[in-house]
């Protein structure tokens, strides 16, 4: 399990242990039970951060 702050993935993606791969958080609405989606929920997407600096 990736420790917080140690994810090798770029912004907007999250690590899937199941697939051994960074996966796009944009797929989570269609597949909300994917293991990597927990990592996507941990931080708001980049455009949210721009709204609330």
């Amino acid at each position: 399990e990736q420790a917080p702050g140690t994810s090798p993935c770029s912004s907007g993606s999250s690590w899937s242990a199941d697939l051994d791969k960074c996966m796009d958080c944009a797929s989570c609405p269609a597949r909300p039970h994917s293991d990597f989606c927990l990592g996507c929920a941990a931080a708001p997407p980049a455009h949210f951060r721009l709204l609330w600096p």
Partner: antibody, heavy 123, light 111 residues
Framework: QVSLKESGPGILQPSQTLSLTCSFS??????????VSWIRQPSGKGLEWLAH???????RYNPSLKSRLTISKDTSRNQVFLKITSVDTADTATYYC???????????????WGQGTSVTVSS | DIVLTQSPASLAVSLGQRATISCRAS??????????MHWYQQKPGQPPKLLIK???NLESGVPARFSGSGSGTDFILNIHPVEEEDAATYYC?????????FGGGTKLEIK
């Protein structure tokens, strides 16, 4: 309807390169999250995962065989390939390809398998 | 590599009774939220067939007499009541990390 079918040489000699083809239908390897694995099974024995290729051409290999394996794909022709170099009698097995794909609950394990192709390495 | 050890290697169960197959992993295949363990059935001359994914989720079309449970390193496949068509070899498989590995198999015979 998803289906996969493996093809190979049947018999080859030690030290040769084994080339296998997986031809599939009913899904596309251009779909995000999709992938195909190769697995082998010596007669009367268990299953060994060999390699996996993703829709984005990312590849994963079993470390115990990595130096001998090459997986590749032709997305437009719905085919995945596996090459194993320097084969030996220990590589005699039935070789399967199987799909891993996305569903609502996340990502399937290997949910669809081909019937397998038998490979014998003999001098 | 995570080694999956299945037990027993073979078992014979009377028609209508319960079959219990164990799969023990050499290290945890679970996280706080997921257990990456799957079960397959293989009959002679056929490829494996996915039965259960992520410990307990029945694959579409698989009869409800199959069930899975467990977490961490210890997992169970139960079949109850056993039917004639369940005679097969059963394999566990994890996807917690690479390489994905399989258990050695359990051969189920129906008495």
């Amino acid at each position: 309807q998803v289906s996969l079918k493996e093809s190979g040489p049947g018999i080859l000699q030690p030290s040769q390169t084994l080339s296998l083809t997986c031809s599939f239908s009913g899904f596309s390897l251009s779909t995000s999250g999709m992938g195909v694995s190769w697995i082998r099974q010596p007669s009367g024995k268990g299953l060994e995962w060999l390699a996996h290729i993703y829709w984005d051409d990312d590849k994963r290999y079993n470390p115990s065989l990595k130096s001998r394996l090459t997986i590749s794909k032709d997305t437009s022709r719905n085919q995945v390939f596996l090459k194993i170099t320097s084969v030996d009698t220990a590589d005699t097995a039935t070789y399967y390809c199987a799909r891993r794909g996305p569903d609502y609950y996340g990502y399937y394990p290997m949910d669809y398998w081909g019937q397998g192709t038998s490979v014998t390495v003999s001098s | 590599d995570i080694v999956l050890t299945q037990s027993p290697a073979s078992l014979a169960v009377s028609l209508g009774q319960r079959a219990t197959i164990s799969c023990r992993a050499s290290k945890s295949v679970s996280t706080s939220s997921y257990s990456y363990m799957h079960w397959y059935q293989q009959k002679p001359g056929q490829p494996p067939k996915l039965l259960i994914k992520y410990t307990s989720n029945l694959e579409s079309g698989v009869p409800a007499r199959f069930s899975g449970s467990g977490s961490g390193t210890d997992f169970i496949l139960n079949i109850h009541p056993v039917e004639e068509e369940d005679a097969a070899t059963y394999y566990c498989q994890h996807s917690r990390e690479l390489p994905w590995t399989f258990g050695g198999g359990t051969k189920l015979e129906i008495k």
